[in-house]
Interface confidence: medium
């Protein structure tokens, strides 16, 4: 089930998915001066079975110099309602399908792809927010949003994140409370999701962290 809307927009913040749920579509967009190859895929699709998920179809771009106009790829009409742009990040995440069952990782870049990626998310997708450079987080979290199905309609949960400029006052006048009161960990809000189940499993597995000196130079 595709999500009807885009994830919420937070001023001065960007969002990113850690992994994409099966059913997610990624438009095959090409940068200016290039177009999809003839009979090329319109989109990549995250598909899989119980043990493995991967992106179906390959996006391919070719020079459009021989044409009079640059053809811009747009979603099909039925996709139009859920057109979400995320900026390309370089370097891309490693393609590691094993860590989150039922999810695909960020697809590797294709030659001459557009600078922004347009995803069509499905119910259960989680995205994470961070303030852009030059802004700092006020109400430090949970800076995530989940597409949920409620009474037959999809909606994104509201991330508790405000990004304020370094020069701005650290407290807004009259701003005493976060947008939603902190009542519990995200698991309680989204316990049906594979991603949050993972978080819970991690806690129960008593995750560990180990520090060590990597390089020390003494002069």
């Amino acid at each position: 089930e595709l999500c009807d809307d885009d994830p919420p927009e937070i001023p001065h913040a960007t969002f990113k998915a850690m992994a994409y749920k099966e059913g997610t579509m990624l438009n095959c967009e090409c940068k200016r001066g290039f177009r999809r190859i003839k009979s090329g895929s319109l989109y990549m699709l995250c598909t899989g079975n119980s043990s493995h998920s991967s992106w179906d179809n390959q996006c391919q771009c070719t020079s459009s110099a021989t044409r009079n106009t640059t053809k811009q790829v747009t979603p099909q009409p039925e996709e139009q309602k859920e057109r979400k742009t995320t900026e390309m990040q370089s370097p891309m995440q490693p393609v590691d399908q094993a860590s989150l069952p039922g999810h695909c990782r960020e697809p590797p870049p294709w030659e001459n792809e557009a600078t922004e990626r347009i995803y069509h998310f499905v119910v259960g997708q989680m995205v994470y927010y961070q303030c852009v450079q030059g802004y700092r987080a006020l109400h430090r979290g949970p800076a995530e949003s989940v597409c949920k199905m409620t009474h037959g309609k999809t909606r994104w949960t509201q991330p508790q994140l405000i990004c304020t400029g370094e020069m701005e006052t650290s407290q807004f006048p009259g701003e005493e409370k976060p947008q939603a009161s902190p009542e519990g960990r995200p698991e309680s809000e989204t316990s049906c999701l594979v991603t949050t189940t993972d978080f819970q499993i991690q806690t129960e597995m008593a995750a560990t962290m180990e520090t060590s000196i990597f390089t020390t130079e003494y002069q």
Partner: antibody, heavy 106, light 107 residues
Framework: PGSSVKVSCKAS????????ISWVRQAPGQGLEWMGG????????NYAQKFQGRVTITADESTSTAYMELSSLRSEDTAVYYC????????????WGQGTTVTVSS | DIQMTQSPSSLSASVGDRVTITCRAS??????LNWYQQKPGKAPKLLIY???SLQSGVPSRFSGSGSGTDFTLTISSLQPEDFATYYC?????????FGQGPKVEIK
């Protein structure tokens, strides 16, 4: 003094990318001081103003490892350096590394 | 940056005592307050998050309360293993800041 140190922090036991990894230091007999943090899926780090320009925090998702490099070391940087995991900058730092002692001496 | 002030600066107590540590923020931080316990030579351990939620695996004798600027950590009946330093930390805004951490010592 004047040199750099790079401390690594390897996470095991689950998802690494979506957590915030913070670096906190503790000078001998002193309290806890947050230096900065990173959310690996974004790759960009936040730093405390005090350390801005002297600290660099990075993360390698493929190895579930975070790094903290502190340059232009001075004697007052002698401390135990901890990495800690936060469930997205809000629910407290629930998993901590055992700490790495850095001694700056001439 | 938000300043966190804890009181008392240190305290002596006996096993079985009810112990209360307070933490005051320099501005309202809603419920974005966490409590940690630290023993000598060890990493801090999260006890309470979001002012009053008990972290998994932490004994129920620990409790937290408060919102806005004033917060309290209570140990209902002090146990031998509870003698340690306790830090409060705000996670309302960046950078997160800690209180100075009073030490709970054996009387």
């Amino acid at each position: 003094p004047g040199s750099s140190v790079k401390v690594s922090c390897k996470a095991s036991g689950g998802t690494f990318s979506s957590y915030a990894i913070s670096w906190v230091r503790q000078a001998p007999g002193q309290g806890l001081e947050w230096m900065g943090g990173i959310i690996p899926i974004f790759g960009t780090a936040n730093y405390a103003q005090k350390f801005q320009g002297r600290v660099t925090i990075t993360a390698d998702e493929s190895t579930s490892t975070a790094y903290m490099e502190l340059s232009s070391l001075r004697s007052e940087d002698t401390a135990v350096y901890y990495c800690a995991r936060e469930m997205y900058y809000y629910y407290g730092m629930d998993v901590w590394g055992q700490g790495t002692t850095v001694t700056v001496s001439s | 940056d938000i300043q966190m002030t804890q009181s008392p600066s240190s305290l002596s107590a006996s096993v079985g005592d009810r112990v209360t540590i307070t933490c005051r923020a320099s501005q309202s931080i809603s419920s974005y307050l966490n409590w940690y316990q630290q023993k000598p030579g060890k990493a801090p351990k999260l006890l309470i998050y979001a002012a009053s939620s008990l972290q998994s695996g932490v004994p129920s004798r620990f409790s937290g309360s408060g919102s806005g600027t004033d917060f309290t950590l209570t140990i209902s009946s002090l146990q031998p293993e509870d003698f340690a330093t306790y830090y409060c930390q705000q996670s309302y805004s960046t950078p997160p800041t800690f209180g100075q951490g009073p030490k709970v010592e054996i009387k």
